[in-house]
C-alpha cells in the first residue's frame, strides 16, 4: 500500500502516513526529494504532528552563538538543539503554520499556541510573524511580532544596546525581550535565563522549553485521515 505522502513536507504529513511515535523523521521541503531534512517530530502533544525546532532541557548545548549558527541550526535533535532559521523560513513558506510552545518547571507546565506563525527569508533577517494566542503561559510572544532575528554579531533590535550581547542569547528581540528561550540555561539573573515573562517572569530560568510548529489546518487533515 502506497503512502499518503511519499515525501512528507512536515511532521503532520508523516503522522498522516501512520507514524505516531515521537522521534526523528525525514521531511522534504515542498515535497521535493532533493530537499531532505531530519527533524524531531512530537506526535503526542495536542494531537501530534509537530516539528520541534527548539528544545532546552539541561544546559549542555551552548545557545550563545552567532548569526551563521542560528541560520544553519545546531545541536542534537534528540536533546538540546535549534533547527535553524533557514529551515524555519522554508518550512513556513510551504503554507499556513501554527506555533506551540511547551514549558515545564518542577512539575508545573504551561503552553502557548499561536495559530499564525511564520519566519521570513534571510533578506528580511528572518522576520517573525506570530498571531492568535491561546494557552496558559501568557501571551509573551506578542511583543516580538514583526521583529527580525538578532544575534550578538548581527544586531537588528530596536534597543540602544545589543540585546543578544546583553542577555547572552539570540531571539527576535525588540527592546529587549519578553521571551528569551535561547538565554543562558539556569541563570536566574534578571532577563539572562530561559525566560517566558508572563509565566515565570524575568528572574527565573525555566527548566524545559520546546517550540514546535505544524500546519494550521492539521485538525481538518487529521479528521480526513480518520474518516478514510
Amino acid at each position: 500500500i502506497g503512502l499518503l505522502y511519499p515525501f512528507p513536507r512536515d511532521c503532520s504529513q508523516a503522522m498522516l502516513n501512520g507514524d505516531t511515535t515521537s522521534g526523528l523523521y525525514t521531511i522534504y521541503i515542498n515535497g521535493d526529494k532533493t530537499q531532505a531534512l531530519e527533524v524531531y517530530c512530537d506526535m503526542t502533544s495536542d494531537g501530534g504532528g509537530w516539528i520541534v525546532f527548539l528544545r532546552r532541557k539541561n544546559g549542555r548545548e551552548d545557545f550563545y552563538r552567532n548569526w551563521k549558527a542560528y541560520a544553519a541550526g545546531f545541536g542534537d535533535r534528540r536533546e538540546e538543539f535549534w533547527l535553524g532559521l533557514d529551515n524555519l523560513s522554508k518550512i513556513t513558506a510551504q503554507g499556513q503554520y501554527e506555533l506551540r510552545v511547551d514549558l515545564q518547571d518542577h512539575g508545573e507546565s504551561a503552553y502557548a499556541v499561536y495559530d499564525r506563525f511564520s519566519v521570513g527569508d534571510a533578506k528580511s533577517r528572518y522576520k517573525l510573524k506570530v498571531e492568535g494566542y491561546s494557552g496558559t503561559a501568557g501571551d509573551s510572544m506578542n511583543y516580538h511580532n514583526g521583529r527580525s532575528f538578532s544575534t550578538y554579531d548581527k544586531d537588528t533590535d530596536s534597543a540602544i544596546t545589543n540585546c543578544a550581547l546583553s542577555y547572552k542569547g539570540a531571539f527576535w528581540y525588540k527592546n529587549c525581550h519578553r521571551v528569551n528561550l535561547m538565554g543562558r540555561y539556569g541563570d536566574n539573573n534578571h532577563s539572562q535565563g530561559v525566560n517566558w515573562f508572563h509565566w515565570k517572569g524575568h528572574e527565573y530560568s525555566i527548566q524545559f522549553a520546546e517550540m514546535k510548529l505544524r500546519p494550521s489546518n492539521f485538525r481538518n487533515l487529521e479528521g480526513r485521515r480518520k474518516r478514510a
Partner: antibody, heavy 120, light 107 residues
C-alpha cells in the same frame, strides 16, 4: 487619518454608573490593544485599563478592579469602559489610547479625552 | 507596582538651551520606557518609545537614552513649542505606570 474620539463623559453622583465609548478610525482596529488612561484635574497621567486586539485579555489598575469593565466591538471599531460604583476620586479626563504594537507598549495615538465628574 | 520617579519636577529654561530630564524606575525594566509631551488642554503625544526610538514626525532635537533603571530625555536646543509637561512611562509590566511629570517653562 488615524483618529480616536471619546464620548460618554458627564456629571454623575457617587455610586452611580457611566459608560464611556471610543470610536476608532484610520487603522486596522482589531490588530491593536487599546487602553484607557485618566488624568485628574491638575494631576499626572494614570493608566486605568487595557484590552488585547481580540478582546481575549483584559487588564486593570488596582484602583478600578471590580468596578470598571473594559470591552471592545471590533466590528464597530469601538472601545468601551463601563464604570460602576463611581467615587469622587474617579473624577478625571479619560483618554482612549492605542497601543503601539503589543499589549504592554507605548501609546502612539490618543483621543482628545472625555471628562467624568463624580459629585453629589 | 513599578514606581517611576522623574526629576526635576519642574525647570525653567530659555530658547536654545539644552534640557535634560531623568526618569528612574523602582526595578529593572530593560528598555521598556517611553516619553510623552503634553501641552495644556491637549492629549499627551508620544515622543520616544523603547527608551531611544524617535516616534515618526518628532523633531530630531529630542533624544532618549538609558537602560535598566535609569533613563534620560534630552532636548538639544529648546524651541518655543517645546514648553510643556513631559512624562515617562514604563511598559515593562502591567500596570503600566507614569512618572509624575516634569514641567518645562520659560525662564
Amino acid at each position: 487619518q488615524v483618529q480616536l474620539v471619546e464620548s460618554g463623559g458627564g456629571l454623575v453622583q457617587p455610586g452611580r454608573s457611566l459608560r464611556l465609548s471610543c470610536a476608532a478610525s484610520g487603522f486596522t482596529f482589531d490588530d491593536y490593544a487599546m487602553h484607557w488612561v485618566r488624568q485628574a484635574p491638575g494631576k499626572g497621567l494614570e493608566w486605568v485599563s487595557g484590552i488585547s486586539g481580540s478582546g481575549g485579555s483584559t487588564y486593570y489598575a488596582d484602583s478600578v478592579k471590580g468596578r470598571f469593565t473594559i470591552s471592545r466591538d471590533n466590528a464597530k471599531n469601538s472601545l468601551y469602559l463601563q464604570m460602576n460604583s463611581l467615587r469622587a476620586e474617579d473624577t478625571a479626563l479619560y483618554y482612549c489610547a492605542k497601543s503601539y504594537q503589543s499589549d504592554e507598549d507605548a501609546f502612539d495615538i490618543w483621543g482628545q479625552g472625555t471628562m467624568v465628574t463624580v459629585s453629589s | 507596582d513599578i514606581q517611576m520617579t522623574q526629576s526635576p519636577s519642574s525647570l525653567s529654561a530659555s530658547v536654545g538651551d539644552r534640557v535634560t530630564i531623568t526618569c528612574r524606575a523602582s526595578q529593572y525594566i530593560q528598555g521598556f520606557l517611553n516619553w510623552y509631551q503634553q501641552k495644556p488642554g491637549k492629549a499627551p503625544k508620544l515622543l520616544i518609545y523603547d527608551a531611544s526610538n524617535l516616534e515618526t514626525g518628532v523633531p530630531s532635537r529630542f533624544s532618549g537614552s538609558g537602560s535598566g533603571t535609569d533613563f534620560t530625555l534630552t532636548i538639544s536646543s529648546l524651541q518655543p513649542e517645546d514648553f510643556a509637561t513631559y512624562y515617562c512611562q514604563q511598559s515593562y509590566s502591567t500596570p503600566q505606570t507614569f512618572g509624575q511629570g516634569t514641567k518645562v517653562d520659560i525662564k
